[in-house]
């Protein structure tokens, strides 16, 4: 019961986390105009991974997409890639974890198979969460660097009377959404991994006995098999006590990492 609860909770937490990662990736407020110690303007600027926006005091909002790939900073491209990899891994993890849920019965799937799938999805959630946290942190670091650079240059080039006020950017809401979502996905992944241990049956060393009506001879079958979480175990022995046969390969192929540039 506790295992089912842990697995279910891990799934729900990961689901919320991945939804948050998707939301953060799509949000426009990755960086917002710093209003502190700046002249008050009737225009507010904010930027996302895919476009930059301007909101005027009237409420009029105008967004422009980044219609270039080569012209964008490498760091921004890296952040995009990390977030997309995080979403893809998370989505696959969710798909795998749905079939791994103990409360869902699919054919004659054994607990060992569900344990393997739970572990796989858990690892995927952990990597997904780490990708999101890394992406958001890289962007935040980029912002901090640019903030202090623009602060230093804020009043440069004031040759005469004319001043150019440089727009400084600070952390936007998307960063906090991303950090929290990444953390939730990570926690969900850990919970799935913990649940996996509970799902896997303990190693048994009893001997399965086969009785024959014709004689008194007793045939001993090879001892217990491990409900291992190692990939690729192909156990074809029949277990008398549950009558279930394992003939399918438990091979988990990880998705290849694409370059989103």
């Amino acid at each position: 019961m506790a295992v089912t609860a842990c697995q279910g909770l891990g799934f729900v937490v990961s689901l919320i986390g991945i939804a948050g990662i998707i939301a953060a990736t799509c949000m426009d407020q990755w960086s917002t105009q710093d209003l502190y110690n700046n002249p008050v303007t009737a225009v507010f600027n904010y930027q996302g991974l895919w476009r930059s926006c301007v909101r005027e005091s009237s409420g009029f909002t105008e967004c422009r997409g980044y219609f270039t790939l080569l012209g964008l900073p490498a760091m921004l491209q890296a952040v995009r890639a990390l977030m997309i990899v995080g979403i893809v891994l998370g989505a696959i993890g969710l798909l795998v974890s749905i079939f791994a849920l103990k409360c869902i019965r699919i054919g004659s799937m054994e607990d060992s198979a569900k344990a393997n799938m739970t572990l796989t999805s858990g690892i995927m959630f952990i990597v997904s969460g780490l990708c999101a946290i890394a992406g958001v942190s890289v962007f935040a670091n980029m912002l901090v660097t640019n903030f202090w650079m623009s602060t230093a240059n804020m009043y440069t080039g004031m040759g005469g009377m004319v001043q150019t006020v440089q727009t400084r950017y600070t952390f936007g809401a998307a960063l906090f959404v991303g950090w929290v979502a990444g953390g939730l996905t990570l926690i969900g992944g850990v919970m799935m991994c913990i649940a996996c241990r509970g799902l896997a049956p303990e190693e048994t060393n009893y001997k399965a006995v086969s009785y024959h009506a014709s004689g008194h001879s007793v045939a001993y079958k090879p001892g217990g098999f491990k409900a291992s979480t190692g990939f690729g175990s192909n156990t074809k022995n029949k277990k008398i006590y549950d009558g279930g046969a394992r003939t399918e390969d438990e091979v988990q192929s990880y998705p290849s990492k694409h370059d989103y540039v």
Partner: antibody
Framework: QVQLQESGPGLVKPSETLSLTCTVS????????VSWIRQPPGKGLEWIGV???????YYNSALKSRVTISVDTSKNQFSLKLSSVTAADTAVYYC????????????WGQGTLVTVSS | DIVMTQSPDSLAVSLGERATINCKSS????????????LTWYQQKPGQPPKLLIY???TRESGVPDRFSGSGSGTDFTLTISSLQAEDVAVYYC?????????FGGGTKVEIK
């Protein structure tokens, strides 16, 4: 169509408070901002302040301590209060709607002349 | 506060000729986020309230004749009347629409020579 009409006393005594209202029609007060502008006789335009649809207000720094702009949505009216007036506050007072985009004023009232004199 | 300086104070131009009014701001009115200049031009005829001509430095308000055009970026802006008509006699004001408080230039009076 969009209309703005200023109203208020044409004569105000020095040190008193000048109160003007701007009655609007043809647009929603919650969607658009309204600015107040004044023009002393024979002189240029001076921006007094703005109240945006969301309720944010900004004022001319020279008048900030004396001016208040408010809204009464039930009456479709904006109001301007300017305290401790002097002869220098004698002007034609205009209210104008803020355009949606560009922070420009696209519709203006006809203006009302306010004279500060004892 | 932003100081808006208009030049000349007055301008006499023959009918059909080009009229050019300059406006200079003490700070750049260019917003880096959308690359728009928040400068507005108004026309005020005698005994009338001002009328919006141009916003975002170069975008004509609907109904404004195309002989009126705005140009410039940053701190230096120009309003051009390509072919002056009798009805264009008025005072023209530029306005900072970027920084609070919004401020107007002193105005340029356009007359017929």
């Amino acid at each position: 169509q969009v209309q703005l009409q200023e109203s208020g006393p044409g004569l105000v005594k020095p040190s008193e408070t000048l109160s003007l209202t701007c009655t609007v029609s043809g647009f929603s007060l919650t969607d658009y901002g309204v600015s107040w502008i004044r023009q002393p006789p024979g002189k240029g335009l001076e921006w007094i302040g703005v109240m945006w649809g969301g309720g944010n207000t900004y004022y001319n720094s020279a008048l900030k301590s004396r001016v208040t702009i408010s809204v009464d949505t039930s009456k479709n009216q904006f109001s301007l209060k300017l305290s401790s007036v002097t002869a220098a506050d004698t002007a034609v007072y205009y209210c104008a709607r803020q355009r949606y985009g560009g922070n420009a004023m696209d519709y203006w009232g006809q203006g009302t002349l306010v004279t500060v004199s004892s | 506060d932003i100081v808006m300086t208009q030049s000349p104070d007055s301008l006499a131009v023959s009918l059909g000729e080009r009229a050019t009014i300059n406006c200079k701001s003490s700070q750049s009115l260019l917003n880096s986020g959308n690359q728009r200049n928040y400068l507005t031009w108004y026309q005020q005829k005698p005994g009338q309230p001002p009328k919006l001509l141009i916003y975002w430095a170069s975008t004509r308000e609907s109904g404004v004749p195309d002989r009126f055009s705005g140009s410039g970026s940053g701190t230096d802006f120009t309003l051009t009347i390509s072919s002056l008509q009798a009805e264009d006699v008025a005072v023209y004001y530029c306005q900072n629409s970027y920084f609070y408080p919004f401020t107007f230039g002193g105005g340029t009076k356009v007359e017929i020579k």
